[in-house]
Interface confidence: medium
């Protein structure tokens, strides 16, 4: 892809319509509001030549310099251009695919979203108002020879003779001229060196560099070729009317013989290489939905076959201030929820035959990260989290809370800024993650804000699988399994032994393994085992057991 800042800014203030393209020599006026940057000179229209292999060196005739035309929304109109600035800044382009100047209204495209606008508006076709693409990546040629930029009342009269040939690799207007600069600053061009005899030129010479615009009729599916000349020319076999050749079939060559009373034989034989039908091309939005928040992809699709040589078809895009010379473009790193205007055109043998404009609004971007204000637990089974919402658009929140390897997620309303978590496990670390999301072309999740808390302690659950076994006449062995839920920071097992209602033993161990000795013989005992977590005791497990009558 070749994005190209436009070289010469052209104002549209005086022009009722905005043409989209220019054709080969002698070139078309590029009318458009200024875009950037190195090639642009403000307040001047500039013409450009096509960079085709057979146009490497061309003589510029005085007539051809007066005949710049522009493609129009309602047809073709002639656009008079102001004077050309002298290019004091050198431009030295080399042959390449970059389109040189492109002054575009898209440069003034809104960089902020427009409320109520459609995400995509498509202005297809053969006559839409769009931008101007000069076909030439090389030298600008003027339509009027004026040296006003050099004018100065303080300068003395000066006469200079210069003879230069116009070459598309040059950066300056080249013509054979004699220039007189008067003290008042006006430039007078004497034609003494341009035409040394009053004889008429041949029509072949006069119209050597005639340019053509093609207009398409969707109903008849035929083209009209508009000959870009000022005078009403005559065509052999009366094939043209008002400088227009009608009923041309796509992808067919037509030969037109051009003559006029201001020139002599031989006539100019113009071969019209008719482009493919406009409806065979469609500008398609090829943006991947996953990336539609920050990228735009546009692609010309051939939706029907045609016999024209596809090698002769070139595609141009202008998005904002940059130009691309591809059939497909992809703009990256764009702003979400912004409108971007792209103008495009298709040229056949450097003649524009269709164009389209798209205003694409990038999709909603991922929401920002919510800002957690606090997140804490003030009870054994509850926690609370509060937050500020993210700045960018979003639809809802997802709150996830993770304990060890378990994860639970909740969908929360976008208006919430606080959530109370219930039924939590006591004395457990919970990691919370909160993110906003938006359902756009796809769901886009914002970055998650994280926090954590540990719930308060609670009584542990009961020990289990408690056993009491006699190891001797007056000794017992008490064992139990740990509680399922400790619910606190510490681990201690307690055993209370009662005879009747009297507590006779009270022991505490790290493990639930007690050896109780020296009990009374033939006595009923109550054994109570429970777990203490440092904050709370658990419910005791109670077993009754009796010592036997002493065997001795």
């Amino acid at each position: 892809q070749s994005p190209t800042p436009s070289p010469t800014g052209l104002t549209t203030a005086k022009m009722p319509s905005v043409p989209l393209s220019s054709d080969p020599l002698p070139t078309h006026t590029t009318a458009f509001s200024p875009a950037s940057t190195f090639e642009r000179e403000n307040d001047f229209s500039e013409t450009t030549t096509s960079l085709s292999p057979d146009n490497t060196s061309t003589q510029v005739s005085p007539d051809s310099l007066d005949n710049a035309s522009a493609f129009n929304t309602t047809g073709v109109s002639s656009v008079q251009t102001p004077h050309l600035p002298t290019h004091a800044d050198s431009q030295t382009p080399s042959a390449g695919t970059d389109t040189q100047t492109f002054s575009g209204s898209a440069a003034n495209a809104k960089l902020n979203p427009t409320p109520g606008s459609n995400a995509i508006s498509d202005v297809p076709g053969e006559r839409s108002t769009a931008s101007t693409f000069p076909t030439d990546p090389v030298s600008p040629l003027t339509t009027t020879l004026s040296l006003a930029h050099h004018s100065s009342a303080a300068l003395p009269a000066r006469t200079s003779n210069t003879t230069i040939t116009a070459n598309t690799s040059d950066a300056y207007l080249n013509a054979s001229e004699t220039t007189t600069l008067s003290p008042s600053g006006s430039a007078v061009i004497s034609t003494t060196t341009i035409a040394t005899t009053p004889s008429k030129p041949t029509c072949d010479e006069k119209y050597a560099n005639i340019t053509v615009d093609y207009l398409y009729n969707k109903e008849t599916k035929l083209f009209t070729a508009k000959l870009n000349v000022n005078e009403n020319v005559e065509c052999g076999n009366n094939t043209c009317t008002n400088n227009e050749v009608h009923n041309l079939t796509e992808c067919k060559n037509a030969s037109v013989s051009i003559s006029h009373n201001s020139c002599t034989a031989p006539d100019k034989t113009l071969i019209l290489d008719v482009p493919p039908g406009v409806e065979k091309f469609q500008l398609h939005d090829c943006t991947q939905v996953e990336k539609a928040d920050t990228t735009i992809c546009l692609k010309w699709k051939n939706i029907e076959t045609f016999t024209c040589d596809t090698q002769n078809i070139t595609y141009r895009f202008q998005c904002g201030n940059m130009i691309f010379d591809n059939k497909e473009i992809k703009l990256e790193n764009l702003e979400p929820e912004h409108e971007y205007k792209c103008d495009s055109e298709i040229l056949y043998n450097n003649h524009k035959f269709t164009n389209a404009s798209k205003i694409i609004k990038t999709d909603f971007g991922s929401p920002g990260e919510p800002q957690i204000i606090f997140c804490r637990s003030e009870a054994a089974h509850q926690g609370v989290i509060t937050w500020n919402p993210p700045q960018r658009s979003f639809h809802n929140f997802t709150l996830c809370y993770i304990k060890e390897t378990e994860k639970d997620c909740l969908n929360l309303d976008k208006n919430l800024i606080k959530y109370d978590l219930q039924n939590l496990k006591p004395y457990t670390k919970y990691v919370l993650s909160l993110h906003a999301y938006i359902i756009a072309k796809v769901q886009r999740n914002g970055s998650a804000a994280m926090c954590h808390f540990t719930t308060k302690s609670a009584p542990p659950s009961q020990v289990w699988n408690m056993t009491v076994s006699m190891t001797s006449d007056n000794s017992m062995h008490v064992k139990c399994r740990p509680p399922r839920d400790r619910n606190g920071p510490h681990e201690r097992y307690h055993l209370e032994v009662e005879a009747g209602n009297t507590l006779v033993r009270n022991e505490s161990h790290k493990n639930c393994d007690f050896r109780v000795k020296d009990l009374q013989y033939s006595t009923d005992y109550t054994f109570k085992a429970y777990f203490h977590n440092g904050d709370y005791p658990g419910e005791p497990f109670i077993l009754h057991h009796s010592t036997s009558y002493n065997s001795k």
Epitope: Q1, S2, P3, T4, P5, P7, G9, S33, P34, A35, S36, T37, F38, E39, R40, E41, N42, D43, D89, Q91, T92, P93, S94, A95, G96, T97, D98, Q100, A107, N108, L111, P137, C319, G320, N321, M322, D325, L331, E332, N333, Y340
Partner: antibody
Amino acid sequence: EVQLVESGGDLVQPGRSLKLSCIASGFTFTNFWMTWIRQVSGKGLEWVASISSSGGSIYYPDSVKDRFTISRDNAKNTLYLQMNSLRSEDTATYYCVKLHYYSGGGDAWGQGTSVTVSS
Amino acid sequence: DIQMTQSPSFLSASVGDRVTINCKASQNINKYLDWYQQKHGEAPKLLIHYTNNLHTGIPSRFSGSGSGTDYTLTISSLQPEDVATYFCLQHSSRWTFGGGTKLELK
């Protein structure tokens, strides 16, 4: 993250040549116009040269025209500035700059490389 | 060539102050104006592009305005880290920079 790293700056005698390089990363180099800007120590900024994404269009101001050549190698993501017939007034820090995709201004700059022309 | 006249060339302000820097073009530049911040020993950094569009990652206290030939950079509430030299750049026709405004804290 967009990164532009210039190199090749040196102390040279007037009339000699020097070639600056700028390696780009973090963006699709082939999609963007590039520019060289220079700054005389403690002074203002001056545009030096610009090149289109494919290298097909090149622009210079009068001050360096016919002496400096900007070029790029898209396969290597590298921008070059060949400086010939150097003069003392070319002494400056030279910055490699990426043009904004939409408006055409300079949206990312390298840290610069210092060129001193002195006998 | 389009000339850019930037004023003032030197500015001293206090933290929290509203600061404005102006650039005047010798002819209409159709909003093709960017503002850059350059801190000592560093490369310039884009703040505002195309007159009033805040570049990614730049604090919202920076704003730009203007049209035709007159353009303004505004810092709504000056912060210590804003001490730098500020340049305007027109890229309507080739590139020309303003002379710079050195901003210091009082």
